[in-house]
């Protein structure tokens, strides 16, 4: 029986250039967490196994770091990240339970309002 | 080097059981999953059984057309999967092949070079 | 009748490209990471693509791999005689709580 459940950061937002952590957390079980898997729609991010270790895709190895913990840090970010991230929790004995992150990167507010106001 | 040998194949009568085993050298045995896979005379690859590295508590996984008559099992201290087939028919003809699977839900990077089975009266 | 679909044949002349795609469920594709297997003849499967789209070192980069929804492909860019074999689409399946293959396409290069 899954008693545990994902909580993660939910709706977040960062700027166009600047990094983000994704981060979720399984409570409320007693099971082992054997892997963990950052997924975007159809594209592996990377996966965290406990035996193993960490496998970043090669897609996005200068671009994203392992941690803090299990979470994952996506860096130089650009407006195409925006979208859903999946954290997907491999336990025992529980089975899988999968969390959502959706993450909306902005243009720069620098870059949009620096000009007005420059100081003359 | 990654190593893996399969044995105990061989011509057996419908219903007779046989038990295939693969040896495994080469690599940390105990924390990979490992899995069997079978291929009938031209045919495609059937995935047969699976069983979780010891992380996950040696699980065991079946396909629908041999639950509950195959029989998956590991001795991680000598480093060797096995497969219990019993009431064998037919249909179970085929080269048997053992593969490692890395990562949960990962690939099968290492296969062996299989064993045949022929189910035969 | 196999979990997921895959053309029984596919073929191309020397240089061209081939691309075989490989048709699934919500339950197996649409949830999880697709695997290419190419199996030449007369020898055990070898890993070919994994995780949708990584390639094993020494796998030549004309091999490439995507997956969208509950469908994914391979293509070969510039198909050479050497790459005649039966090629598998793979996937783990949350209904079957098991690995699924495709029926497999068997590749003559022309």
């Known amino acids: 029986m899954m008693t545990g459940t994902i909580e993660t950061t939910g709706n977040i937002s960062a700027e166009k250039g600047g990094s983000i952590i994704l981060q979720c957390h399984l409570s409320s079980t007693t099971a082992q967490v054997t892997q963990v898997n950052w997924e975007q729609q159809d594209q592996l991010l990377a996966i965290c196994n406990a035996d193993l270790g960490w496998h970043i895709s090669p897609s996005f190895k200068d671009r994203v770091a392992p941690g803090p913990g299990l979470g994952l840090t996506l860096q130089s970010l650009t407006v195409n990240d925006t979208g859903e991230y999946f954290c997907i929790y491999h336990t025992y004995p529980d089975g899988t339970y999968t969390g959502r992150i959706f993450l909306e990167v902005l243009e720069s507010s620098v870059a949009e309002h620096g000009a007005r106001f420059q100081i003359p | 080097d990654v190593q893996l040998v399969e044995s105990g194949g061989g011509v057996v009568r419908p219903g007779e059981s046989l038990r295939l085993s693969c040896a495994a050298s080469g690599f940390n045995f105990s924390t990979y999953a490992m899995n069997w896979v079978r291929q009938a005379p031209g045919e495609g690859l059937e995935w047969v059984s699976g069983?979780?590295?010891?992380?996950?508590?040696?699980?065991?996984y079946y396909a629908d057309s041999v639950r509950g008559w195959f029989t998956v099992s590991r001795d991680n201290s000598k480093n060797t999967l096995y497969l219990q087939m019993s009431s064998l028919r037919a249909e179970d003809t085929a080269v048997y092949y053992c593969?490692?699977?890395?990562?949960?839900?990962?690939?099968?990077?290492?296969w062996g070079l299989g064993t045949l089975v022929t189910v035969s009266s | 009748q196999s979990v997921l679909t895959q053309p029984p044949s596919a073929s191309g002349t020397p240089g061209q490209r081939v691309t075989i795609s490989c048709s699934g469920s919500?339950?197996?594709?649409?949830?999880?990471?697709v695997y290419w297997y190419q199996q030449l003849p007369g020898t055990a499967p070898k890993l070919l693509i994994y995780?949708?789209?990584e390639r094993p070192s020494g796998v030549p980069d004309r091999f490439s791999g995507s997956k969208s929804g509950t469908s994914a492909s391979l293509a070969i860019s510039g198909v050479q005689s050497e790459d005649e074999a039966d090629y598998y689409c793979?996937?783990?399946?949350?209904?079957?709580?098991?690995?699924?293959f495709g029926g497999g396409t068997k590749l003559t290069v022309l």
């Open positions: 069983i979780s590295g010891r992380s996950s508590g040696d699980t065991t």
């Open positions: 995780f949708n789209n």
């Open positions: 593969a490692r699977e890395t990562w949960i839900r990962g690939y099968f990077d290492y």
């Open positions: 793979a996937t783990w399946d949350d209904s079957l709580n098991g690995w699924v």
């Open positions: 919500r339950s197996n594709l649409g949830n999880n990471l």
